[in-house]
Interface confidence: low
Amino acid sequence: QEGPLPRPSISAEPGTVIPPGRPVTIVCRGPVGVDQFRLEREDRSKFNDTKDVSQASPSESEARFRIDSVSEGNAGHYRCLYVKSTRWSEHSDYLDLVVKETSGDTDSPVTEPDSSAGPTQRPSDNSHNEHAPASQGLSAEHLY
């Protein structure tokens, strides 16, 4: 009997608080070998499936769901699940995407922190302008 599939994680880049008209990417992560990720809205009334799965680290795969220009209609709670070897995983935690104007220059990157389900620190291409990592077992998105 196969054991339970690892629970996926969910995060948003550059953050979970996004000004209207700005892009956001919701990232779902699971184990290596995932066949398909699904991103669901809170009530499951809307979902988006993708088989465009990449290796995020030696032990993780990921899918990226990009919204090019967010609006109030994109605000809400999202969660991920995946299919591996014909089995569905359980759901990730919810991610709360907030769409609102932020103070200051909206042309600059959104610097508000992600939710607790957000991404961990990761190595950088130019370590002087990104966070340094805590350890290897983290997102390797920077490598893509």
Partner: antibody, heavy 117, light 107 residues
Framework: EVQLVETGGGLVQPKGSLKLSCATS????????MNWVRQAPGKGLEWVAR??????????YYADSVKDRFTISRDDSQSMLYLQMNNLKTEDTAMYYC????????WGQGTTLTVSS | DIQMTQSPASQSASLGESVTITCLAS??????LAWYQQKPGKSPQLLIY???SLADGVPSRFSGSGSGTKFSFKISNLQAEDFVTYYC?????????FGGGTKLEIK
């Protein structure tokens, strides 16, 4: 089977130009960062350049030794990687390898560049 | 830039013995370190990634350890085909620097 095949090497005079190509197959090219690594005769390995994916705006990075002279590019529709080399110097003489990111897990067989007058 | 200092530059050993190669990073790199083997006239081959993880198809006599700034690579029960050159590389930040290499020779 993953394959990376470099072409375009040859003999070039100093200050000349050359473009290397890398044809790839057997994996999903457009979701992988790609790199060029070189090795001068009898010397060690030197990372040259890297290009990220479309999701990351095709960001590029270069070794200081080639910055402003070399340009890395990719054609996701053809699963091709390129390295345009300008203002070549004798110290650029090396075997050039196309390498799949992110973990440098697949390398091409290499193509030789000789810069000499 | 991060400097990678690999030692020794060359080492002699006998068949069946074990050897250890060390790589020191000039600043902390977590475990963003890889080890490669290169045979004469061939392309490098990934052996170890993430400092300790064995790449697909690599025999278990190869192993890696370490984190932060000090890393080790061990080959146990040396076989004839192991007497080639090995490199470490940091993948923490660009430029992705390599160590200078270690050439293993039969004693």
């Amino acid at each position: 089977e993953v394959q990376l095949v470099e072409t375009g090497g040859g003999l070039v005079q100093p200050k000349g130009s050359l473009k290397l190509s890398c044809a790839t197959s057997g994996f999903t090219f457009n979701i992988n960062a790609m790199n060029w690594v070189r090795q001068a005769p009898g010397k060690g390995l030197e990372w040259v350049a890297r290009i990220r994916t479309k999701n990351n705006n095709f960001a590029t990075y270069y070794a200081d030794s080639v910055k402003d002279r070399f340009t890395i590019s990719r054609d996701d529709s053809q699963s091709m990687l390129y390295l345009q080399m300008n203002n070549l110097k004798t110290e650029d003489t090396a075997m050039y390898y196309c390498v799949r990111g992110p973990y440098f897990d697949y390398w091409g067989q290499g193509t030789t560049l000789t810069v000499s007058s | 830039d991060i400097q990678m200092t690999q030692s020794p530059a060359s080492q002699s050993a006998s068949l069946g013995e074990s050897v250890t190669i060390t790589c020191l990073a000039s600043q902390t790199i977590g475990t963003w370190l890889a080890w490669y083997q290169q045979k004469p006239g061939k392309s490098p081959q990934l052996l170890i990634y993430a400092a300790t993880s064995l790449a697909d198809g690599v025999p278990s006599r190869f192993s890696g350890s370490g984190s932060g700034t000090k890393f080790s690579f061990k080959i146990s029960n040396l076989q004839a085909e192991d007497f080639v050159t090995y490199y470490c590389q940091q993948l923490y930040s660009t430029p992705y620097t390599f160590g200078g290499g270690t050439k293993l020779e039969i004693k």
